[in-house]
Amino acid sequence: APVRSLNCTLRDSQQKSLVMSGPYELKALHLQGQDMEQQVVFSMSFVQGEESNDKIPVALGLKEKNLYLSCVLKDDKPTLQLESVDPKNYPKKKMEKRFVFNKIEINNKLEFESAQFPNWYISTSQAENMPVFLGGTKGGQDITDFTMQFVSS
């Protein structure tokens, strides 16, 4: 089936926005006013995955770019990266596992768990201007809760 996608931005629970930091990295920082235009717009695609009544599998691409968030092992550690793909073949309903995140909604907040590495989540640091990363802890110092803002196509 054709993949269903929507455009959105994400902010962490401390209201930090996500922006590009170089060609293959995202960072989180507080933005205001016109600077809000810097924040990345995601194309969130609803894909096949280990769906449950609580978890919805999604892929997170950068709108109008052939880049997707993916989870891979680097130096034996689950790592978040931006991966370049062939735009002729993506997005698709059947994404490879490394591209899939389980979107979990709890108390109007969203978590994004890696399908490839269960219990590892898209995370931001408390500190400003730090990379978005894959973290293996919830409820600690690092932030794993996000809100989503819809963006019209």
Partner: antibody, heavy 122, light 107 residues
Framework: EVQLQESGPGLVKPSETLSLTCTVS????????VSWIRQPPGKGLEWIGL???????YYNSPLKSRLTISKDNSKSQVSLKLSSVTAADTAVYYC????????????????WGQGTLVTVSS | DIQMTQSPSSLSASVGDRVTITCQTS??????LNWYQQKPGKAPKLLIS???TLWPGVPSRFSGSGSGTDFTFTISSLQPEDFATYYC?????????FGQGTKLEIK
């Protein structure tokens, strides 16, 4: 060789809880999901729900409020519990292995147990 | 939920006949459709996955085709052991849904 075997009481009283066990061999429950499917006598197949390798579950909406699927990886067993049963829950209950082929056939079911008939009657 | 319309619900045929069963889905499921054979008192057996891929060990007289919303299952030359009930299953999205079944009987 992949095998699945359902077991449990063949007769359950109305309003009670139906409990079934699916014992598997030839694959690991930590790697593959298992679905439950039922078939009322003389009728078609209805997908009930499943449990994934990681333990997450998806329950079909009509049964969601009455259904619990759980598993014990070390015993290679998946269990189904359906509460507050009525005569409409009389069926042959099957468990089946998910193919779990990412980016190809994640949701398909390949191997099935032989099924067990559960009758709901007082 | 994706609705499945399988037809015919029953079919009489003779050994050697070519038999076709169709399955129509309420929305586009690409090729995410399986076909199963069930004999009385037995569990369903997978014959075809992903619309057209023959399951290992299944005779080549069985075939499947189609994509999107329209699918066809064919037995090219009926054998005595093929008299059974056949079901389609969509594996595109949850909840998984089956067709109503086609009972294939001896004419």
């Amino acid at each position: 060789e992949v095998q699945l075997q359902e077991s449990g009481p063949g007769l359950v009283k109305p309003s009670e809880t139906l409990s079934l066990t699916c014992t598997v061999s030839g694959f690991s429950l930590s790697e593959f999901g298992v679905s439950w499917i039922r078939q009322p006598p003389g009728k078609g197949l209805e997908w009930i729900g499943l449990i994934w390798g990681g333990g997450d579950t998806y329950y079909n909406s009509p049964l969601k409020s009455r259904l619990t699927i759980s598993k014990d990886n070390s015993k290679s067993q998946v269990s189904l519990k359906l509460s507050s049963v009525t005569a409409a829950d009389t069926a042959v209950y099957y468990c089946a292995k998910q193919r779990n082929l990412w980016a190809y056939d994640l949701y398909g079911m390949d191997y099935w147990g032989q099924g067990t008939l559960v009758t709901v009657s007082s | 939920d994706i609705q499945m319309t399988q037809s015919p619900s029953s079919l009489s045929a003779s050994v050697g006949d070519r038999v076709t069963i169709t399955c129509q889905t309420s929305q586009d499921i690409d090729m995410d459709l399986n076909w199963y054979q069930q004999k009385p008192g037995k569990a369903p057996k997978l014959l075809i996955s992903q619309g057209s891929t023959l399951w290992p060990g299944v005779p080549s007289r069985f075939s499947g085709s189609g994509s999107g919303t329209d699918f066809t299952f064919t037995i090219s030359s009926l054998q005595p052991e093929d008299f059974a009930t056949y079901y389609c299953l969509q594996t595109d999205s949850f909840p998984l849904t089956f067709g109503q079944g086609t009972k294939l009987e001896i004419k």
